[in-house]
């Protein structure tokens, strides 16, 4: 995928409200592109954050404005809303409902869109073909907050235009903008550790990579030209940077260790991979 | 931009259909209200259609108008015109929640 | 169904001065207020939406504030051009379906 990013492409917002009372809450709204967080809710000042110089995509400052207000009323609301429904709904203090909501792109083509709400982190209801729809495990409550959300099509349509027209709009703008930064290649560093014991006469090998960009990598221990399949991967971990971070992982004997390398595969490396020695590495660490 | 179309002089109990015409948007994508203004009075909603092609109207405006669209234009039916239904009737868009673009209106006058 | 009462009926300011129009909503609408200035013989135009945004083109001393059930529009530094109707709107009632106005505020500038 030229833009770096790994296919489908989205774009989601999050919004996550606690309630701690009936008079205490408090919200955290973030945007998303992919696994990218691009934009951030300022609560205090009811404004967008736009976290990358390119995070407007090509929306007009009118345009945000608009969509500032509209987020600024529907949060408002939406605390409301669920705050005078929760007896009815029999939600109980304290309790968290989480928001998630986007389009997605493959090859370059708007393939959908989605909306779904949890409650204190388990499904609840999702918003498709215009209306709200109960989850069947979320029970009776879910199927009356459908029917409140449902009373109201006009709001439905505004939920609807924002899904299949806004946000497909934008996140095809915000790819265009933020294409330099997308494409770019940045090569990863690689180091050799020893991890914790994990017995007597055994070693922990730790291989760690950093620093590269795009996310897609290779790592694997390895003995000569076969791959160890004892290998460990852990996840791969945001740095604050907008680079990535991986360490792998392998147990062997003490006496085995003398000849395994560890190979980092990464698009920035043109094909030149990266390969380290453990019997190089020093004993630091 | 928005044009209205169709007021008239006419004699009570006349229906009458207003037009309403779209350009340089898509009325798939937004809502479409009439607002009406009585000849030195204030503005009154009517109603409005949203982009799905749902209906809601005023209390006092419930079977005395009816809305209804086609891709390109959005339509106000007065099913019975009464001496109280003159004035200019405006068509305008609604963006999200607000009223951003309005026509120029047209003046319906209902007399015997 | 929301009803809102727009105060005064009718304002006169100097050139310079400051006009200050209230509109009190029955019911919270959550900021969902715009304001609207009307010329004679022409459509209303939109000013302010959720209660505070300045709509595009809309010079800065015009000021909306608010929250819950009461919302002001200011004009600071009136100037002749200002002189028109204003009305406020309840720029959605999911309640009711409803959007309606306030009554308007005629502003004269002397």
């Known amino acids: 995928n030229a833009d770096g990013l790994k296919e489908p492409l989205s774009f989601h917002v999050t919004w996550i409200a606690s309630f701690y009372n009936h008079s205490w809450k408090q919200n955290l709204v973030s945007g998303w592109l992919s696994d990218l967080q691009t934009h951030t809710w300022d609560s205090n000042s009811s404004t967008i954050v736009f976290l990358c110089p390119w995070s407007r995509g090509n929306f007009s400052n009118e345009e945000w404005k608009e969509l500032e207000t509209l987020f600024r009323i529907r949060t408002i609301r939406s605390f409301e809303g669920i705050r005078r429904y929760a007896h009815e709904l029999q939600f109980e203090y304290p309790f968290e409902i989480q928001v998630t909501g986007g389009c997605e792109l493959h090859s370059g083509k708007v393939s959908g869109s989605f909306l779904q709400l949890a409650y204190q982190g388990s499904d609840f209801v999702s918003f498709q073909n215009n209306s709200w729809l109960p989850y069947p495990v979320a029970g009776n409550m879910a199927k009356h907050f459908c029917k409140v959300l449902n009373q109201n099509q006009h709001e439905n349509d505004i939920t609807h235009n924002l899904l299949s027209d806004t946000c497909p709009r934008f996140i095809l703008g915000l790819l265009d903008a933020g294409k330099a930064h997308l494409q770019r290649q940045v090569k990863p560093e690689a180091w050799l550790s020893h991890g914790p014991s994990p017995g007597p006469g055994h070693l922990q090998l730790v291989c760690h990579v950093s620093g590269f960009y795009p996310k897609p990598v290779w790592v694997m221990w390895m003995r000569g030209e076969q791959e160890q399949q004892g290998t460990q991967r852990g996840d791969i971990l945001p740095s604050a940077d907008g680079t990535w971070y991986l360490r792998a992982t392998l147990e062997v004997a003490a006496g085995e260790a003398a000849d395994l390398s560890c190979r980092v595969k990464h698009s920035s490396l043109e094909g030149q991979d990266i390969v380290l020695y453990w019997e190089h590495h020093s004993s630091v660490g | 931009s928005v044009e209205e179309s169709g007021g008239r002089l006419v004699t009570p109990g006349t229906p009458l259909t207003l037009t309403c015409t779209a350009s340089?948007?898509?009325?798939?994508?937004?809502?479409m209200s009439w607002v009406r203004q009585a000849p030195g009075k204030g503005l009154e909603w009517i109603g409005i259609?949203?982009?799905?092609?749902s209906t809601y109207y005023a209390s006092w405006a419930k079977g005395r108008f009816t809305i209804s669209k086609t891709s390109t234009t959005v339509d106000l039916k007065i099913t019975s015109p009464t001496t109280e239904d003159t004035a200019t009737y405006f068509c305008?868009?609604?963006?999200?929640?607000?009223?951003?673009?309005w026509g120029q209106g047209t003046l319906v006058t209902v007399s015997s | 169904a929301v009803e809102m009462t727009q105060t005064p009926a009718s304002v006169s300011a100097a050139v310079g001065g400051t006009v200050t129009i209230n509109c009190q909503a029955s019911?919270?609408?959550?900021?969902?207020l715009a304001w609207y200035q009307q010329k004679p013989g022409q459509p209303p135009k939109l000013l302010i939406y959720?209660?505070?945004t300045l709509a595009s083109g809309v010079p800065s001393r015009f000021k909306g504030s608010g929250s819950g059930t009461e919302y002001t529009l200011t004009i600071s530094g009136v100037q002749c051009d200002d002189a028109a109707t204003y009305y406020c709107?309840?720029?959605?009632?999911?309640?009711?379906?409803?959007?309606?106005f306030g009554g308007g505020t005629e502003v004269v500038v002397k």
């Open positions: 305008a868009r609604e963006t999200w929640y607000w009223l951003d673009l």
């Open positions: 340089g948007f898509s009325l798939s994508t937004y809502a």
């Open positions: 259609i949203s982009s799905s092609g």
């Open positions: 019911e919270d609408i959550y900021s969902n």
């Open positions: 959720g209660a505070s």
């Open positions: 709107q309840c720029a959605y009632d999911s309640s009711s379906y409803g959007t309606p």
